[in-house]
Interface confidence: low
C-alpha cells in the first residue's frame, strides 16, 4: 500500500524518497527487499542511503527491484516500499510511456512546465530543456529555476518536454533527465473557495471494531489547473504524520476533473483494525487553497451488529 514507483536511466543519478514520512529525528533504514540486505550509508558506495533518501550514483539496470525503507521512532516503525526500475538508454528519440512523468496542462496565461523530481537533487541552474528531443531555442522559451516558461502558448507547443540537469554529490557530477507531456488548454480556469463534497459536515460514520475503515476527503477548488490546492486529514487537531498512530494513515486519492470542468482532489484516511479509542477521536477533513481553508468534521460510531433474534 505504501509503495512508490520510481524510475531512471542507466548511468544517470536517481534519488528516491521513502514513501513513509516521519519527523527528521527518526532514523530510516533501507533494505534491498529481494535479499533483505541492508543498504549502506557510506557515501563511497555507488548506492547508499541518506536518511529518507536512497541514492543511486549512478544507477545501473541491475539496481532494479523493490527497496524497503523503515522509519523508526521510539514508539513505532513505519514501513514503505520503493519499486525502482532502471532502464537502458534509448537509441532513438522516442521517450516510452513508462519513462514519462505526469502530464501538465497550460494555457496562454499559465505555461509553466516543472522539471519532475528535481527538488530531490542538489542541482544548480540553468536547466536544459528539450522538446521532442530538440534543444529549445528562441526568446519564447525561458528556463527559470526549476521550470520552463513558454510565452504566447499555441496548440503547437503541446508535446513531450525533457529537462536535463546535473546533480552534484561530494564534488562528483551526475546527469539526470526527466520527461513529461505538456498539453495546451484553450479555456481559462479560475479558482474558488474550497468546496468539500465529502464528507458532509458533522457526519457520523459507522464502523466495525476490528475491521478496516476508509474515510475520503473530497474537495473541489475551481476550473482548470489548480496549482495551489490541497486536501488532508487531521486527528484531534493534529497532522496525521505528527499524531503517531501507525494504524491511521492518509493516502492521496484521485485528482478528478469533472465534465463541468471542476478540478477536485481526494485524500483517503485509512484506519486499520478499528479500535474503541478511535471512536473518541475527531476527524477533520481540510481543504485549502489561496482563498482559505474549509473544514468538515467526522466522528466514528460503532456499527451495531444485526440482531437476528428480534
Amino acid at each position: 500500500k505504501f509503495s512508490k514507483q520510481s524510475w531512471g536511466l542507466e548511468n544517470e543519478a536517481l534519488i528516491v524518497r521513502c514513501p513513509r514520512q516521519g519527523k527528521p529525528s527518526y532514523t530510516v533504514d533501507w533494505y534491498y527487499s529481494q535479499t533483505n540486505k541492508s543498504i549502506p550509508t557510506q557515501e563511497r558506495n555507488r548506492v547508499f542511503a541518506s536518511g529518507q533518501l536512497l541514492k543511486f550514483l549512478p544507477a545501473a539496470v541491475a539496481d532494479s527491484g523493490i527497496y524497503t525503507c523503515i522509519v523508526r521512532s521510539p514508539t513505532f516503525n513505519r514501513t514503505g516500499y520503493a519499486n525502482v526500475t532502471i532502464y537502458k538508454k534509448q537509441s532513438d528519440c522516442n521517450v516510452p510511456d513508462y519513462l514519462m512523468y505526469s502530464t501538465v496542462s497550460g494555457s496562454e496565461k499559465n505555461s509553466k512546465i516543472y522539471c519532475p523530481t528535481i527538488d530531490l537533487y542538489n542541482w544548480t541552474a540553468p536547466l536544459e530543456w528539450f522538446k521532442n528531443c530538440q534543444a529549445l531555442q528562441g526568446s519564447r522559451y525561458r528556463a527559470h529555476k526549476s521550470f520552463l516558461v513558454i510565452d504566447n502558448v499555441m496548440t503547437e507547443d503541446a508535446g513531450d518536454y525533457t529537462c536535463k540537469f546535473i546533480h552534484n554529490e561530494n564534488g562528483a557530477n551526475y546527469s539526470v533527465t526527466a520527461t513529461r507531456s505538456f498539453t495546451v488548454k484553450d479555456e481559462q480556469g479560475f479558482s474558488l473557495f474550497p468546496v468539500i463534497g465529502a464528507p458532509a459536515q458533522n457526519e457520523i460514520k459507522e464502523v466495525e471494531i476490528g475491521k478496516n475503515a476508509n474515510l475520503t476527503c473530497s474537495a473541489c477548488f475551481g476550473k482548470g489547473t489548480q496549482f495551489l490546492a490541497a486536501v488532508l486529514w487531521q486527528l484531534n487537531g493534529t497532522k496525521i504524520t505528527d499524531f503517531g498512530e501507525p494504524r491511521i494513515q492518509q493516502e492521496e486519492g484521485q485528482n478528478q476533473s469533472f465534465s463541468n470542468g471542476l478540478a477536485c482532489l481526494d485524500m483517503v484516511l485509512r484506519i486499520a483494525d478499528v479500535k474503541e479509542e478511535d471512536l473518541l477521536l475527531q476527524y477533520d477533513c481540510l481543504a485549502l487553497n489561496l482563498h482559505g481553508l474549509r473544514r468538515h468534521t467526522v466522528r466514528l460510531s460503532r456499527k451495531n451488529p444485526i440482531d437476528h433474534h428480534s
Epitope: 527538488d119 542538489n122 529555476k145 526549476s146 496549482f227 490546492a229 490541497a230 488532508l232 485549502l288 489561496l290
Partner: nanobody
C-alpha cells in the same frame, strides 16, 4: 530566528532565519506569527523556486525572500502596526508531500524555529 525587537508604529523591521541542509534547499519555507491568546497564523511563504505567497490581510506591507548562498530566510516588515505585535516563527515543510504546493498554512510545515518577538507600540 533573529531580528525581532520593539519598534514604533509605522516603522520597519527585518527578521531572519538561518536554516540548514535539506530543510533549507528542498522545501516550502514560511513565516508565521502568533499573538498572545490567538492561533498561529500564516504570514508568507516561498517555495524552492522562489515563488512567494502572502496572507491577504498584509496588503503588501511584508516581503519574504531568501538568500540561497547563506541558507537564510528573511521577512521584511514595513509600515508596522500595533496589531502586528506577535512572536514570529520561521518554518519549513514539504508542502503536504504534493508537488509544488507552498502555502503559508500550518499543515504544510514539518520543521519550526523557536520564534522571535516583535512588538509594535503606537
Amino acid at each position: 530566528e533573529s531580528g525581532g525587537g520593539s519598534v514604533q508604529a509605522g516603522g520597519s523591521l527585518r527578521v531572519s532565519c538561518a536554516a540548514s541542509g535539506y530543510t533549507y534547499s528542498s522545501y516550502c519555507m514560511g513565516w508565521f506569527r502568533q499573538a498572545p491568546g490567538k492561533e498561529r497564523e500564516g504570514v508568507a511563504s516561498i517555495d524552492s523556486r522562489g515563488s512567494t505567497t502572502y496572507a491577504d490581510s498584509l496588503k503588501g506591507r511584508f516581503t519574504i525572500s531568501k538568500d540561497n548562498a547563506k541558507n537564510t530566510l528573511y521577512l521584511q516588515m514595513n509600515n508596522l502596526k500595533p496589531e502586528d505585535t506577535a512572536k514570529y516563527y520561521c518554518a519549513a515543510g514539504d508542502g503536504y508531500g504534493l508537488e509544488h504546493i507552498c502555502i503559508p498554512h500550518y499543515y504544510a510545515m514539518n520543521y519550526w524555529g523557536e520564534g522571535t518577538q516583535v512588538t509594535v507600540s503606537s
